[in-house]
Amino acid sequence: ARNGDHCPLGPGRCCRLHTVRASLEDLGWADWVLSPREVQVTMCIGACPSQFRAANMHAQIKTSLHRLKPDTVPAPCCVPASYNPMVLIQKTDTGVSLQTYDDLLAKDCHCI
Amino acid sequence: ARNGDHCPLGPGRCCRLHTVRASLEDLGWADWVLSPREVQVTMCIGACPSQFRAANMHAQIKTSLHRLKPDTVPAPCCVPASYNPMVLIQKTDTGVSLQTYDDLLAKDCHCI
């Protein structure tokens, strides 16, 4: 149940995909990844107001309980709904190889 | 890659399963759910310090970039890794039915 995509907080303030440029040094991968030296990391950032992109029933419950008990129950959180795969070129004991990752780059986002 | 389960912030402070008692009124379900009148909602609450229960490579990246750019990149968030199903007894147009929900109660938690 992917709920409303209208952000009541104003354009770009709610949960959505952002791109953050990161070097291998930033990621702590410099000693084992050869290429690329820079990754355009797509990640999910933004607020999750009531029913905005609610991933499922649990997210809807969380919204209701957060409204009632904000000190106990946190608001839903903006996280990846799916991922884009990526291939990195890595150093190995035997030389250089392609290493595939299915869960590295966010593809789209929801609130949960 | 499910990383360390030791919480550096002290017992019970990090991402874990909590149970929150909620009435149908709390959940906004009073007009369509007949039973149960009260739900023991299991949800994921707590901090996600560096590499604690990191769900995948994306969570590890997020930790690294949050450390570098805390104003831009949020810390990973404590969310369900899986769910327990639940059956509710509902009012329908034709009477009363059992309705199964697969995504209502968190079963275990991770950081993403």
């Epitope: 050869l34 290429s35 030296r37 990526m86 291939v87 250089v96 | -």
Partner: antibody, heavy 120, light 107 residues
Framework: QVQLVQSGAEVKKPGATVKVSCKAS????????IHWVRQAPGQGLEWMGW????????VYAQKLQGRVTMTTDTSTSTAYMELRSLRSDDTAVYYC?????????????WGQGTLVTVSS | DIQMTQSPSSVSASVGDRVTITCRAS??????LAWYQQKPGKAPKLLIY???SLQSGVPSRFSGSGSGTDFTLTISSLQPEDFATYYC?????????FGGGTKVEIK
Amino acid sequence: QVQLVQSGAEVKKPGATVKVSCKASGYTFDSYGIHWVRQAPGQGLEWMGWITAYSGDTVYAQKLQGRVTMTTDTSTSTAYMELRSLRSDDTAVYYCARESGQTSSALGPWGQGTLVTVSS
Amino acid sequence: DIQMTQSPSSVSASVGDRVTITCRASQGISRWLAWYQQKPGKAPKLLIYAASSLQSGVPSRFSGSGSGTDFTLTISSLQPEDFATYYCQQGASFPLTFGGGTKVEIK
């Protein structure tokens, strides 16, 4: 925008050596590796190898091992492919291609190609 | 090495037609397949990576699907500028290998 510009056509005799250049612009040269691919007249595409400008690490196709050398010059953002002991079946268009930003084993954008003709 | 087999080797079609090209890998490559378009005298152009992800700037009439060993490139409504040769390429392991190509010709 990202651009790869290759050196001009070459005619070589069997046994000679050719060195093709590929000048990159529009991005940080040592952030992405360069692949080399060739295409014989009327034929399909054949991957030759890969080099990362950052460290100089290379991977070569086994059939070319010992005859091919890939290098880079970071000061001029240029990649080079040298092929030795040329034979007539090395006649081909030689392409350089950058790793795609999304995944290192997809190729794009590409250079315009360099025709190398091996003939006695 | 992983062998890539493309079919058909050529296809005759008209503007507006739906065209499907298939590519089979000799062993499982998960989703690590790319598709390229090449016009005569020009360099190949990346259309699709990771089996189904459309490269930026590529028209949405191109789509890719498949995983494991069997993959498909579909052009939903062929345009005049789409007459070209199409290649698949596996990106799961070195050496990278290409299919033999499929020439899309005007009927």
